[in-house]
């Protein structure tokens, strides 16, 4: 089942090797499973992580650094993202989305 | 320069509790995930942990899962390994590490390392 | 979990010697693979990182090669100070896994 989230579409432009936060706002009530996506120009988005609610943990996909993905909840109606170190390949459109099951 | 010391380490018995800390300086803390890596003695390295620069996220080896507890104190500059039900397998020297910020990851320099034995 | 195999286990080699030590790992890693020096008594240091960028201050001698499931690391003109234990790792997918060490002794 697929979930709404209450996004609000920024732009932000950071400088190279500096770091970057995006909210993603959680509607209320969503549990399961939230995942955060790259969709860059030409290419499928790729999924870069997911954070399971019910373990309070988050898995990383294949080739993803901690050191460069920064998951954290700052309250329970938002999940946030820090990119790191940033780099030129770094720019994208990042989304986050969810489902129960 | 990036410098990081462990402390902590010692015997304990069997089922016993043991907290390492690994006082960081030289870089700034909260921008970098760290992590643990221990060694048995005369064998390999086997990473243990790794939690995130904002202390939000954390990973285990599953030998540790649900024994060990990662955990930071960004204005102390201060990383921790809680270690609890420990067992004759856990003995070893435990290193911190500074990770990368890259999009693949390693570890940067490492401390020195402290002895951790789980004897009776 | 990602196996790393490291092959020889240990070495025996005389200065100014070419040595090599492979690392193998049980998928694709792509480039996602670290080398570290380890000497007796001492903590690991990185030497390589994502397969082919040597760590700063880490000599020209040292020289890797690979991608995917195969690499290796080539050591010319062995220095007295390259004595030590050498470790691959995959940064791939955690677990992160490291080779069981390849051990380079003097002859």
């Known amino acids: 089942k697929s979930s709404n989230l209450e996004g609000r579409t920024k732009s932000v432009i950071r400088q190279t090797g500096s770091s970057a936060e995006i909210t993603c706002d959680l509607a209320e009530g969503s549990t399961g499973y939230i995942h955060w996506y790259l969709h860059q120009e030409g290419k499928a988005p790729q999924r870069l992580l997911y954070y399971d609610s019910y373990t309070s943990s988050v898995v990383l996909e294949s080739g993803i650094s901690p050191g460069k993905y920064d998951t954290y909840g700052s309250t329970r109606k938002n999940l946030r993202m820090i990119l790191r170190n940033l780099i030129e390949n770094d720019s994208g459109v990042y989304y986050c989305a969810t489902w129960d099951g | 320069q990036v410098q990081l010391v462990e402390s902590g380490g010692g015997l304990v018995q069997p089922g016993g509790s043991l907290r390492l800390s690994c006082a960081a300086s030289?870089?700034?803390?909260?921008?970098?995930?760290m992590s643990w890596v221990r060694q048995a003695p005369g064998k390999g390295l086997e990473w243990v942990s790794t939690?995130?620069?904002?202390?939000?996220?954390?990973y285990y080896a599953d030998s540790v899962k649900g024994r060990f507890t990662i955990s930071r104190d960004n204005s102390k500059n201060t990383l921790y390994l809680q270690m609890n039900s420990l067992r004759a397998e856990d003995t070893a020297v435990y290193y911190c590490?500074?990770?990368?910020?890259?999009?693949?990851?390693?570890?940067?320099?490492w401390g020195r390392g402290t002895l951790v034995t789980v004897s009776s | 979990d990602i196996q790393m195999t490291q092959s020889p286990s240990s070495l025996s080699a005389s200065v100014g010697d070419r040595v090599t030590i492979t690392c193998q790992a049980s998928?694709?890693?792509?480039?996602?693979l670290n080398w570290y020096q380890q000497k007796p008594g001492k903590a690991p240091k990185l030497l390589i990182y994502?397969?082919?960028s040597l760590q700063s201050g880490v000599p020209s001698r040292f020289s890797v090669s690979g991608s995917g499931t195969d690499f290796t690391l080539t050591i010319s003109n062995l220095q007295p100070e390259d004595f030590a234990t050498y470790y691959c790792?995959?940064?791939?997918?955690?677990?992160?896994?490291f080779g069981q060490g390849t051990k380079v002794e003097i002859k």
């Open positions: 590490a500074k990770d990368s910020t890259a999009v693949t990851d390693w570890f940067d320099p």
């Open positions: 030289g870089f700034t803390f909260s921008t970098y995930a």
């Open positions: 939690v995130s620069g904002s202390g939000g996220t954390t």
């Open positions: 998928q694709d890693i792509s480039n996602y």
């Open positions: 994502a397969a082919s």
């Open positions: 790792q995959q940064s791939y997918s955690i677990p992160w896994t």
